[in-house]
Interface confidence: low
């Protein structure tokens, strides 16, 4: 009798193939697209998730004003190159040899160039601002209840250490969640804020990445919190390098 489970699946990533060929006959899972072994006790890196997604069949006062250097992911989906640890490679290129530099969450941070473009290092996204607008409710949510529920969600569902949830702002109907995680703060085993934000984004869109779990059912004191739009801003440790043409557009 081996330690393999009957239901050999990956709870934290449905975009995997699993078989009981790990040590002791236990379940081991590999990400679709890359074939990389993944750690199913925690979140899979955004790079591997994007790669798996691309390989799948196609069918005001208290609110934070995003910095002028904040990035929004306007480029949408692409098939990324991931390093052996599952992180984004600093330089990404498409099939037509168009290349660009990305940050640690895979968002473009330079103008597009050709194969001669150099991206010296993977710049860390250390501050993520998740901007949500919730559907109308009878009254505003209690701020402290909302704060506690969102912190609980990131701690329990995404296993993000509470110290990385810097703040939760609320000015009906806008909710802002600030995640902060410097390179020096992130210890081995800590979930990356970029990965947590991506799982949250997919949950909010009703596209949960968790295996077999129901979709996200967010409630504050029993009252459903339904999100009607999401914007995510990414701030890097080094400001992005775009030409003036783009900045004035």
């Amino acid at each position: 009798h081996t330690a393999a489970q009957d239901n050999c699946t990956c709870p934290t990533n449905k975009m995997t193939v699993c078989s009981p060929d790990g040590p002791g006959g236990r379940c081991q899972c590999r990400a679709l697209g890359s074939g990389m072994a993944v750690d199913c006790s925690t979140l899979t890196s955004k790079c591997l998730l994007l790669k798996a997604r691309m390989s799948a069949p196609k069918n005001a006062r208290t609110l934070v004003r995003p910095s002028e250097h904040a990035l929004v992911d306007n480029d949408g989906l692409y098939d990324p190159d991931c390093d052996p640890e599952g992180r984004f490679k600093a330089r990404q290129c498409n099939q037509t040899s168009v290349c660009w530099c990305v940050n640690s969450v895979g968002v473009r941070r330079t103008d597009k160039g050709d194969l001669s473009l150099r991206c010296d290092e993977l710049v860390r996204t250390h501050h993520i601002l998740i901007d949500l607008r919730h559907r109308p409710t009878a009254g505003a949510f209690n701020h402290s209840d909302l704060d506690a529920e969102l912190r609980r969600l990131f701690r329990e569902r995404y296993r993000l250490h509470p110290k990385f949830v810097a703040a939760v702002h609320y000015e009906q109907p806008t909710i802002q969640i600030e995640l902060r995680q410097n390179t020096s703060q992130k210890a081995a085993g800590d979930v990356d804020i970029g990965d947590a934000a991506y799982y949250f984004e997919r949950d909010i869109k009703g596209e949960s990445l968790f295996q077999g779990r129901g979709g996200l059912d967010l409630r504050v004191r029993g009252e459903p919190l339904q999100v009607e739009r999401t914007l995510i801003y990414y701030l890097d440790e080094i400001p992005p390098k775009f030409s003036m043409k783009r900045l004035t557009a």
Epitope: D6, D39, R213
Partner: antibody, heavy 119, light 112 residues
Framework: QVQLQESGPGLVKPSETLSLTCTVS????????VNWIRQPPGKGLEWIGV???????NYNSALMSRVTISVDTSKNQFSLKLSSVTAADTAMYYC?????????????WGQGTLVTVSS | DIVMTQSPDSLAVSLGERATINCKSS????????????LAWYQQKPGQPPKLLIY???SRESGVPDRFSGSGSGTDFTLTISSLQAEDVAVYYC????????FGGGTKVEIK
């Protein structure tokens, strides 16, 4: 929140079968495995066995011939049966939830129930 | 079966000083696929169930003070308490989960 609670008779006679129940709440029995661990008075921890989320079981090879772990999903209960007990089976018995797909760690434990084997 | 050997059996350390506990496994606990070591550390205080401190050999469980750290790979592992506090008096156990589960014999940490 996640909770586990062991229950059962505190006293069992030698050669009889020890039967304990672990009642769980706050999580799905089909998503997590539950382990049984025991600790004789003043001694260390000994893993007894596990029922994986899929329903299969594994046992400590030293106890395998005497142990059975089962589940009653309608009652959210796991049970442990240890046959032909002796004084050496006197211990605090804990149930603990697997915190991982392959059971790498136990983050949630019951408070334990003390079982004494004596005539 | 994998055998886990802890040393020392007991340890007396002054408040604020470093405490180091060793754990040795009879075979490697490193999964080359996921590059993870299947080793956890637990703390048990009298009359209480064990509490998870460290998993994957070096990952600190949420809420565990950062004075606790785990290190090592393969067959040799260490739990370090960088600055012992009064509330750290307890028995500490390592546990392998590479092939089913085995606990080490425990190390009792006391104040000198």
């Amino acid at each position: 929140q996640v909770q586990l609670q062991e229950s059962g008779p505190g006293l069992v006679k030698p050669s009889e079968t020890l039967s304990l129940t672990c009642t769980v709440s706050g999580f799905s029995l089909t998503s997590y495995g539950v382990n049984w661990i025991r600790q004789p008075p003043g001694k260390g921890l000994e893993w007894i066995g596990v029922m994986w989320a899929g329903g299969s079981t594994n046992y400590n090879s030293a106890l395998m011939s005497r142990v059975t772990i089962s589940v009653d999903t309608s009652k959210n209960q796991f049970s442990l049966k240890l046959s032909s007990v002796t004084a050496a089976d006197t211990a605090m018995y804990y149930c603990a939830r697997d915190e991982n797909w392959d059971g790498a760690w136990f983050a949630y434990w019951g408070q334990g129930t003390l079982v004494t084997v004596s005539s | 079966d994998i055998v886990m050997t802890q040393s020392p059996d007991s340890l007396a350390v002054s408040l604020g000083e470093r405490a180091t506990i060793n754990c040795k496994s009879s075979q490697s606990l490193l999964n080359s696929g996921t590059r993870k070591n299947y080793l956890a550390w637990y703390q048990q205080k009298p009359g209480q169930p064990p509490k998870l401190l460290i998993y994957w050999a070096s990952s600190r469980e949420s809420g565990v003070p950062d004075r606790f750290s785990g290190s090592g790979s393969g067959t040799d592992f260490t739990l370090t308490i960088s600055s012992l506090q009064a509330e750290d008096v307890a028995v500490y156990y390592c546990k392998q989960s590479y092939n089913l589960f085995t606990f080490g014999g425990g190390t009792k940490v006391e104040i000198k």
